[in-house]
């Protein structure tokens, strides 16, 4: 499927890898190697999480593998490619005017960064525009060592960002989640996400969807009317990728937002969200920063229950349990608590009718030199069918004008020992955030909601 | 709804301090946003000078740095402009805004509520 | 520093029509652009940011346009309230750093 794109888009080919500068604004690319795509796939998949610094659980909890580790794993593992998507990028402390010891994963992370670049291995980075983070030079940095920086218009073309935050190694390997290229996600914010090593046909398939952000970071790009079938998906929620994860039967497939960026077979991330929890009959357990079944940064503010909705109808027609963890931190919006209000206001036990929500608070501690820190910032959820690991917060515009990845999986408990499945592992770290005691109910809170730590 | 009003003295002679309080009504200074102060110099150029955050750190305008202070009492709900050794320059009128939403991964700063100014002259 | 420049100071123009106002970055600030309305009284209110995205309250008669280093705000069928001085303001570094303004009156 290697067709070029359209003139106005750029000299890209959606299954090349950008490698290094040209002799004039175009890119000199190369397709992948072919011995790399010849290797037989035996896809593993990896939790992944960040737990901030003072934030102790209690002593014998479950983990997922630190984000820290594994990303340094994934660029360890790296022979030809890594390409990254990521709303902003600050790995080092002066990004931020901080001096603070926490930072220092993040700036090794450059640091491996670089000598990947030194060791002819291409990086691609698709970015967004509008951004944070505007005084970071680690683009300027990687950029001028050979990456190749794309900063995608989606201010422009959709009035929302590139939000998505993920990575493909190789044509082969995967990171995905919650986590933007930022140290203070490696100490400082609590995260989540997923690694999927030698699973191809995913990677791949994630691929496209990077391809669509870099075909729109050339100038005057325009949204196509219709993506080329070469951007085309054919794993989504119909069709999702079936295959043997460690020895687990598993079905996976990647979803994508807006509407907008989604070529012919790619699942809308809102359409896998709503399945995901359409097929619950036992629980949902999702844990988001910011919910608000409203539009978010446009005006006038609109109305938008659709997820609200759907959390409803599981919990009140099909006796589903519900239960919401959402984000609180010195950098949230005070409005969200009249809707999570709303929204538990729904449970009646009397009438089999579930519904529980918490505020997560992350200790502030003698971190509060740290801005926008000290925050769960996952976006996840778990049924007793399926795991959905996401990059977005629930809201509209995350859904309507902004990027961002779903990947949901479905694991088989069959023949493996119970609490092996994807989803009993997330559930069970749902289970570990939401009785912790960092997890406190809308009631527990004080009046002015102010998310202030009362330990 | 927010509102924002300056206050102090009118006449400042040079090389003295200035000070002016802003006083916010209908927000709290600690919950979020960026506290602004920002003047109008005769002929109308606007220049910022500098905000104290929600969490009580600051910047500065470059311009200003060694003779600006802006600091907060959050039990009144103000916070307070200082600008030491002025001169006839520094005649102005004198606005504190605020600047956000600071909410988290938004990437959109606007000034969205201003007060009403303070004229401020430095003669002797 | 960015320096901002409008370089007109002043324009006029009837009451039911059009105007445009321009206002030219000394950089690349890559969208990170606002438009405040000054009143004669000296109120100042926020009108657009992020270049062209309208604040809430604002009438749909304002727009506002533009990339890079040029950008322009314009002000559709013209009425007796829109009678202010425009600034520019770049958010895209600190320091935060405005146009010097344009003022506008009716013929």
């Known amino acids: 499927w290697q067709v070029r794109c359209p003139p106005t888009w750029g000299q890209v080919q959606p299954r090349d890898v950008p490698r290094s500068w040209g002799h004039g604004s175009s890119l000199a690319l190369e397709p992948l190697e072919a011995e790399v795509r010849k290797q037989r796939d035996s896809c593993q998949l990896v939790l992944v999480e960040s737990i901030p610094q003072d934030l102790p659980f209690a002593a014998g909890s479950l983990s997922a593998q630190p984000l820290g580790q594994a990303w340094l794993q994934l660029l360890d593992t790296a022979q030809e490619s890594v390409h990254v998507a990521s709303y902003y990028w600050s790995l080092t402390g002066p990004d931020i005017g901080v001096n603070d010891s926490s930072s220092q994963l993040g700036e090794a992370l450059l640091q491996k960064l670089q000598q990947l670049l030194g060791r002819n291995i291409s990086l691609a980075v698709a970015t967004s525009s509008p951004t944070l983070a505007r005084k970071s030079t680690d683009l300027q940095v990687l950029a001028a060592r050979g990456a190749q920086v794309r900063r995608v218009p989606m201010g422009r073309l959709t009035r929302g960002v590139l939000h998505s935050k993920f990575w493909v190694v190789d044509g082969r390997h995967i990171y995905m989640g919650s986590a933007n290229m930022d140290w203070r996600s490696l100490t400082q914010v609590k995260e989540l996400g997923a690694v999927i090593y030698n699973c191809s046909h995913l990677a791949q398939d994630l691929e496209k969807t990077f391809q669509t952000y870099w075909v729109l970071g050339v100038p005057k790009a325009v949204l196509p009317k219709t993506w080329p079938q070469n951007f085309s998906s054919h794993i989504n929620r119909f069709q999702p990728f079936q295959g043997l994860f460690d020895g687990v039967p598993t079905t996976a497939y990647f979803s994508a937002s807006p509407p907008a960026l989604c070529p012919q077979g790619r699942t809308p991330d809102l359409e896998a969200l709503l399945a995901v929890m359409g097929s619950a009959q036992e629980f949902i357990y999702a844990s988001v920063m910011e919910y608000f079944p409203t539009t978010r940064f446009s005006h006038p503010r609109r109305y938008w229950p659709v997820l609200d909705n759907a959390l409803r109808a599981a919990a009140f027609s099909k006796g589903v349990r519900v239960r919401l963890l959402v984000s609180c931190g010195l950098n949230t919006d005070p409005t969200m608590f009249p809707y999570l209000r709303s929204l538990q206001a729904l449970s009646n036990p009397a009438a089999n009718v579930s519904v529980d929500v918490k505020v997560f608070i992350v200790p502030v501690g003698n971190h509060s030199n740290i801005p926008f820190s000290r925050v769960n910032h996952s976006k996840f959820m778990v049924t007793e069918k399926a795991a959905y690991i996401g990059t977005s917060n629930w809201s509209e515009d995350y859904f309507s004008s902004t990027t961002g990845v779903g990947l949901v999986v479905t694991q088989s408990p069959g023949a493996q020992p119970a609490g092996a499945t994807v989803q009993e592992q997330l559930r069970q770290l749902f289970e570990r955030d939401w009785s912790s005691r960092y997890a406190v109910g809308l009631d527990g809170q004080a009046p002015g909601q102010d998310c202030v730590w009362q330990g | 709804d927010v509102q924002l009003q300056e206050s102090g003295p009118g006449l400042v002679k040079p090389s003295q301090s200035l000070s002016l309080t802003c006083s916010v009504t209908?927000?709290?200074?600690?919950?979020?946003y960026y506290w602004s102060w920002i003047r109008q110099f005769p002929g109308n150029r606007l220049e910022w000078m500098?905000?104290?955050?929600?969490?009580?750190?600051?910047n500065y305008n470059p311009s200003l740095k060694n003779r600006i202070s802006i600091t907060r009492d959050t039990s009144k709900n103000q916070f307070f402009l200082k600008l030491n050794s002025v001169t006839t320059e520094d005649t102005a009128t004198y606005n504190c805004?605020?600047?956000?939403?600071?909410?988290?991964?938004?990437?959109?700063?606007?000034?969205?509520?201003w007060g009403a100014g303070t004229t401020v002259t430095v003669s002797s | 520093d960015i320096q901002m420049t409008q370089t007109t100071s002043s324009l006029s123009a009837s009451l039911g029509g059009s105007v445009t106002i321009s206002c030219r970055a000394s950089?690349?600030?890559?969208?990170?652009l606002n438009w405040y309305q000054q009143k004669p009284d000296g109120t100042v209110k926020l009108l657009i940011y992020?270049?062209?995205r309208l604040h809430s309250g604002v009438p749909s008669r304002f727009s506002g346009s533009g990339s890079g280093t040029d950008y322009s705000l314009t002000i559709s069928n013209l009425e007796q309230e829109d009678i202010a001085t425009y600034f520019c303001?770049?958010?895209?570094?600190?320091?935060?750093?405005f146009g010097g303004g344009t003022k506008l009156e009716i013929k």
């Open positions: 303001q770049q958010f895209n570094t600190l320091p935060r750093t």
């Open positions: 992020y270049t062209s």
């Open positions: 805004a605020r600047e956000g939403p600071l909410y988290y991964g938004n990437p959109y700063w606007y000034f969205d509520v």
């Open positions: 950089q690349d600030i890559d969208n990170y």
């Open positions: 500098g905000y104290i955050s929600y969490d009580g750190s600051n």
């Open positions: 209908g927000y709290s200074i600690s919950s979020h």
